[in-house]
Amino acid sequence: SSPTSSASSFSSSAPFLASAVSAQPPLPDQCPALCECSEAARTVKCVNRNLTEVPTDLPAYVRNLFLTGNQLAVLPAGAFARRPPLAELAALNLSGSRLDEVRAGAFEHLPSLRQLDLSHNPLADLSPFAFSGSNASVSAPSPLVELILNHIVPPEDERQNRSFEGMVVAALLAGRALQGLRRLELASNHFLYLPRDVLAQLPSLRHLDLSNNSLVSLTYVSFRNLTHLESLHLEDNALKVLHNGTLAELQGLPHIRVFLDNNPWVCDCHMADMVTWLKETEVVQGKDRLTCAYPEKMRNRVLLELNSADLDCDPILPPSLQTS
């Protein structure tokens, strides 16, 4: 590959690429060194090549770009800005590329970008404007339809002094740019809670994956606005019970399928409403697999087989009768 490039100067919003132009005229259909290209499939794969930067000479025809298994570390503003722009780029996979910093405007100048996968990168520093590209209160709508953010939590010693959940949610909500998002995957991120405003501002969601987190409760989460939601993955969390409000909201979603396997359900008196609901609802997939984790006497009991007599709470003794 000769050192030509189709990158150019978007100096205001993409200073990083303002200097990515060579002396020769660009060869827009050239395949970068260390990459494999198929013009017929409109696909470029630069996989497991230890790249430290996004290639500058990506062919203009690229629709599917795989940059997985590299060592990119940081995505600056305009990391994919080119002249002419990568107008066809629809699917971008950056998973497992050791990214820990994604800056504001990193995905600007990609007008057709519908699928973005940042999974398996330790994102200690995800800018609130990574996806919106602007700090305006209302940004131009992002074309993103699928955003895959599985296992982006950094190791504990690399996390900043702020809520990781909050950082991710700020990026999802900035400028209301992701109003058209249909699939959001946030699995395996050690989320302890789901900020209450996040779902209300993603009204187009069809698929939401929150599996393998540490969610204890959905009490303050509202699903009411997600009228298009088709699948909700809550497997492998720390859920103890779903309360009436949540049950009613889920039941009211016309197309929903909910996945609840492998949660430590607490089968006491607070579980009665959920058990009743499970017996009647069709929305829970594999509901016959749900079992109690606590109390000990109820461990491994199938929720669907419980009746109200099984679900008791130990009486709370008045302080005068409590013993140490």
Partner: antibody, heavy 120, light 111 residues
């Protein structure tokens, strides 16, 4: 021991061309990005160009964009800078330098430099 | 482009005394993950040499009398006890974005 040795400098007239080379030894050349940095007489340091380890990324200072081309031959452990349409203001000592990446990197090894003089 | 401004332009310090050189960037060159600021020493007739990377990390083989600090836009290079061999020009450099730019240099001399 890491060694970078530049060559190809000289006196050239404005508008003419010159090609600089940088021979690398003592490290795995193909694992490192490379830069050219220059220093005009009595002046400070100015970054000129960068090429990634596998020649997938190229970046240039505005002052040389469209005139200079950076390239490398990993089989020969050699970095190049093709300089066309030279101007008087390109007069400088040109250093090649090594880095582990563009933004997260730094210039951790330098050559002794080669002098380019553009004069009529 | 990010402008790097060093102060002072020149500095004379007695042997064994502390020398401090400042560098200011026209915008922040730090993220929560990394600080994109590095220091170099250039002795007369020689190429530059890396001293400090990412604001505060001492390059291998550099004497520990050299130290760096700072974040955001303001950075400092300190030589705790000046030695005769430290006479040189010192440059800061950012790697936040392209173009990479250097400070104008600070000339350090013996008083």
């Amino acid at each position: 021991e890491v060694q970078l040795v530049e060559s190809g400098g000289g006196v050239v007239q404005p508008g003419r061309s010159l090609r600089l080379s940088c021979a690398a030894s003592g490290f795995t050349f193909s694992n490192f990005g490379m830069h050219w940095v220059r220093q005009a007489p009595g002046k400070g340091l100015e970054w000129v160009a960068y090429i990634s380890s596998g020649s997938t990324s190229f970046y240039y200072a505005d002052t040389v964009k469209g005139r200079f081309t950076i390239s490398r031959d990993n089989s020969k452990n050699t970095l190049y800078l093709q300089m066309n349409s030279l101007r008087a203001e390109d007069t400088a000592v040109y250093y090649c330098s090594r880095t582990n990446s563009l933004l997260r990197g730094f210039f951790d090894a330098w050559g002794q430099g080669t002098t380019v003089t553009v004069s009529s | 482009d990010i402008v790097m401004t060093q102060s002072p332009d020149s500095l004379a310090v007695s042997l064994g005394e502390r020398a401090t050189i400042n560098c200011r960037a026209s915008q922040s060159v730090s993220s929560s993950s990394y600080t994109y600021l590095h220091w170099y020493q250039q002795k007369p007739g020689q190429p530059p040499k890396l001293l400090i990377y990412s604001a505060s990390n001492l390059e291998s083989g550099v004497p520990d009398r050299f130290s760096g600090s700072g974040s955001g836009t303001d950075f400092t290079l300190t030589i705790s006890s000046l030695q005769a061999e430290d006479v040189a020009v010192y440059y800061c450099q950012h790697s936040w974005e392209i173009p990479l730019t250097f400070g104008q240099g600070t000339k350090l001399e013996i008083k």
